[in-house]
């Protein structure tokens, strides 16, 4: 049995512009005021951190300036958007949620969202 329950969609298809959005929802045992959300990518047996943000409940998520992620929060729900994706980035994206404050610390891991990215076909030259 996992710790805190975290739900995320099983599959998401990235747009032709390489943008994928999904909701990560967690069941908080109590009234957390500081939450950390991390997106992890699992490919084969390798897990790498894609992006992370800490936010105060009621405030916006703030990712680093050079992050490929953006997001908004509403209650126990986080809307995540990953940009700049290419076909090679297809994989399982796991949402990790940590309740940082007040103590006690709680952790939850989602089952992952399989994001499929298809590189757009280059436009053929057209003669008019």
């Amino acid at each position: 049995c996992k710790a805190m329950h975290v739900a995320q969609p099983a599959v998401v298809l990235a747009s032709s512009r390489g943008i994928a959005s999904f909701v990560c929802e967690y069941a908080s045992p109590g009234k957390a005021t500081e939450v950390r959300v991390t997106v992890l990518r699992q490919a084969d047996s390798q897990v790498t951190e894609v992006c992370a943000a800490t936010y105060m409940m009621g405030n916006e998520l703030t990712f680093l300036d050079d992050s490929i992620c953006t997001g908004t929060s509403s209650g126990n729900q986080v809307n995540l958007t990953i940009q700049g994706l290419r076909a090679m980035d297809t994989g399982l994206y796991i949402c990790k949620v940590e309740l940082m404050y007040p103590p006690p610390y709680y952790l939850g891991i989602g089952n992952g969202t399989q994001i499929y990215v298809i590189d757009p076909e280059p436009c053929p030259d057209s003669d008019f």
Epitope: C1, K2, A3, H5, A27, S28, P29, G30, K31, L40, V47, I94, K96, E98, M100, P102, P103, P104, Y105, Y106, L107, I109
Partner: antibody, heavy 115, light 107 residues
Framework: EVKLDETGGGLVQPGRSMKLSCVVS????????MNWVRQSPEKGLEWVAQ??????????YYSDSVKGRFTISRDDSKSTVYLQMNNLRAEDMGVYYC??????WGQGTLVTVSA | DIQMTQSPASLSASVGETVTITCGAS??????LNWYQRKQGKSPQLLIY???NLAEGMSSRFSGSGSGRQYSLKISSLHPDDVATYYC?????????FGGGTKLEIK
């Protein structure tokens, strides 16, 4: 100040029962999952049982070594968590700690199982 | 069940030295790891939570690192007061298993 105060330990014969209690103050009891963890010289720290809170339907979890013999329960109105221990064995001996999440720990109560 | 393997089982170092204790999980625990300090005759105290976060009231000489299956606890500039047994614990999934402990002594 956070306080977790365990009581109910002592000497008990193998096969008999014992009930531990833990009264909590200083943090919001109903917002938290409560655990019992035991410490013995042979096994070090060993998690025993967990009870979650209302948002998690008061789900309970047990280590394989105590499943079917121990029962964890809670009374949110009294900020108290309990551990009912039946059919006690020599290997159940140790200091039993009540924990809030795994952040806050009580001072422990000693359980001795001996004929 | 996730197994936690801690090493070394015991360790002796001099005041002022830096020591490292390691903890390995039998599978990826995604940073779901706590470290505890238990002094003789006292209750365990949370030292590090979520692999890297220092618990309230604990000295900044303690630091945690690691990810995946491998984690470590570093104690810098060892003090006599650091004599204790240190435990790691999986906090990702039940059963919430502990490592076997590392007993730290001062030379």
């Amino acid at each position: 100040e956070v306080k977790l105060d365990e009581t109910g330990g002592g000497l008990v014969q193998p096969g008999r029962s014992m009930k531990l209690s833990c009264v909590v103050s200083g943090f919001t009891f109903s917002d938290n999952w409560m655990n019992w963890v035991r410490q013995s010289p042979e096994k070090g720290l060993e998690w025993v049982a967990q009870i979650r809170n209302k948002p998690y339907n008061f789900e309970t979890y047990y280590s394989d070594s105590v499943k079917g013999r121990f029962t964890i329960s809670r009374d949110d109105s009294k900020s108290t968590v309990y551990l009912q221990m039946n059919n006690l064995r020599a290997e159940d001996m140790g200091v039993y700690y009540c924990t809030g999440g795994f952040t806050y720990w009580g001072q422990g109560t000693l359980v001795t199982v001996s004929a | 069940d996730i197994q936690m393997t801690q090493s070394p089982a015991s360790l002796s170092a001099s005041v002022g030295e830096t020591v490292t204790i390691t903890c390995g999980a039998s599978e990826n625990i995604y940073g779901g790891l706590n470290w505890y300090q238990r002094k003789q005759g006292k209750s365990p105290q949370l030292l590090i939570y979520g692999a890297t976060n220092l618990a309230e009231g604990m000295s900044s000489r303690f630091s945690g690192s690691g990810s995946g299956r491998q984690y470590s606890l570093k104690i810098s500039s060892l003090h006599p007061d650091d004599v204790a047994t240190y435990y790691c614990q999986n906090v990702l999934s039940s059963p919430w298993t502990f490592g076997g402990g590392t007993k730290l002594e001062i030379k």
